[in-house]
């Protein structure tokens, strides 16, 4: 996150860090617990990941320093990509994780509300991104959740800044015309959550951007209010 | 077919002008960052320049600074190299490849399409 | 500015050896490195990316590890079509840089 401040413990407890064992582990990307046994993230964190043997899911976690070899984690059974997904700037930058075994749900690891598809009107002023990603371009990932508040851009605003781009309803994005603050590197995936009415809603997810912070290029993220249907049909499948 | 074609090499003096363009077809130029990467005679791979999708952002390896220009034509699906003040280290076969980069996405793509390149020579 | 240091410059061996050929950043590059192919009169060719990920038509012959300053690129078992010059890119900032190298021939 660029021009972020540090979380604190439980803030965003929604939020999960996704690590890959191969060649060595690292943190993948970000994800956000939507049910006991699912995590709601990017389908271009899976570019070269050939089975879901190699994932593992850490909740509840603030600084990446406390996953140690023996720091309990949930393996990952599926990995369900929309199958319209091709690249991020495409669109259908959606995943599902299903988990091994289910989450006790804690102060520290729940869900967060998927929107509804009757909020669509909703203008949401208050939402922030968050992840443990670079804090410009150039850097490393860091060791404590970081949290930043964006506003929300209109799609047509959007599109003025992405010519070479079509901004599709199935994105929303957000980010200051002046730039400073915003998503990079590693926190894809993670979620836009936004608070309305005092409850939290998984508004968008971290997909793409040109640059991180810069001016006149906002972050482009998918909008989750667009795939609530499919969400459900493949969570609730038997 | 995803193909880099790159044109506009030939032989010139010392202290003289070439432009170089490479046309891209079979995907979507505008979402690739572009370089262009030389390798003088009997050597090894040298950056030379990066522009990012949009052409706002341009990079340059110190040998070329201030010399050379890169600049895309996303309309045209075209990257160029204007090359100024030209040595006889600059002697070279000059490629452009393309890389893909999610500034989101812990992920390094690689330049992953390259075109088969031009000769350009420096000599009196 | 990121050094990339590749060793050896050149190495001789035969069809059915196991080859490694590694690189050393100067600093952190993350998984920022690529590792490319290269015949003579051709274009360089990628072949692995993010430090690990073989790209698709690479023989598994073919693999990368390493992360942060060291990398290597290992070819397994050597086939007569393997004899090339081999480079590592650091892909983590700029400017860019190749390693300087690896010619393999037949022994």
């Known amino acids: 996150i660029v021009g972020g401040t540090a979380s604190v413990r439980g803030e965003w407890p929604w939020q999960v860090t996704l690590h890959t064992t191969s060649p060595t582990q690292r943190h993948l990307c970000g994800g956000s617990i939507i049910g006991n046994q699912w995590i709601l993230t990017a389908a271009h964190c899976f570019y070269g990941v050939e089975s879901p043997k190699i994932l593992r899911v850490y909740s509840g976690i603030l600084n990446q320093s406390e996953i140690k070899e023996d720091t309990s984690f949930f393996g990952v059974q599926e990995i369900i990509i929309h199958d319209q997904y091709k690249m991020a700037e495409s669109g259908y930058d959606i995943a599902l994780l299903k988990l091994e075994t289910t989450v006790n749900y804690t102060d520290s690891q729940r869900p967060i509300s998927l929107p509804s598809k009757g909020d669509r009107n909703v203008i949401y002023t208050d939402c922030w991104v968050t992840g443990w990603g670079y804090r410009k371009l150039r850097d490393k990932i860091q060791n404590t959740l970081q949290k930043a508040k964006i506003p929300l851009v209109t799609n047509e605003e959007c599109q003025k800044r992405y010519r070479g781009h079509k901004i599709t309803h199935k994105m929303i994005c957000a980010g200051y015309r002046e730039g400073g603050k915003d998503a990079c590197k590693g926190d894809s995936g993670g979620p836009l959550s936004c608070k309305h009415n005092e409850v939290w809603h998984l508004v968008g997810i971290t997909s793409w951007g040109e640059g991180c912070a810069q001016r006149e290029r906002p972050g482009v993220y998918t909008n989750v209010v667009e795939y609530v249907d499919w969400i459900l049909e493949k969570t609730q499948a038997v | 077919e995803v193909q880099l074609l790159e044109s506009g090499g030939g032989l010139v003096q010392p202290g003289g002008s070439l432009r170089l363009s490479c046309a891209a077809s079979?995907?979507?130029?505008?979402?690739?960052?572009m370089h262009w990467v030389r390798q003088a005679p009997g050597k090894g791979l040298e950056w030379v320049s990066s522009i990012s999708p949009s052409g706002g952002l341009t990079s340059y390896a110190d040998s070329v600074k201030g010399r050379f220009t890169i600049s895309r034509d996303n309309s045209k699906n075209t990257l160029y190299l204007q090359m100024n003040s030209l040595r006889a280290e600059d002697t070279a076969v000059y490629y452009c490849?393309?890389?893909?980069?999610?500034?989101?996405?812990?992920?390094?793509?690689?330049?992953?399409?390259w075109g088969q390149g031009t000769t350009v020579t420096v000599s009196s | 500015d990121i050094q990339m240091t590749q060793s050896p410059s050149s190495l001789s061996a035969s069809v059915g050896d196991r080859v490694t050929i590694t690189c050393r950043a100067s600093?952190?590059?993350?998984?920022?490195l690529g590792w490319y192919q290269q015949k003579p009169g051709k274009a360089p060719r990628l072949l692995i990316s993010d430090a690990s990920t073989l790209q698709s038509g690479v023989p598994l012959r073919f693999s990368g590890s390493g992360s942060g300053t060291e990398f290597t690129l290992t070819i397994s078992s050597l086939q007569p079509e393997d004899f090339a010059t081999y480079y590592c890119l650091q892909g983590y900032n700029y400017p860019r840089t190749f390693g300087q190298g690896t010619k393999l021939e037949i022994r």
């Open positions: 600093g952190d590059i993350g998984n920022a």
């Open positions: 490849a393309r890389e893909f980069e999610n500034a989101y996405h812990y992920y390094y793509y690689g330049m992953d399409v």
């Open positions: 079979g995907f979507t130029f505008s979402r690739y960052i």
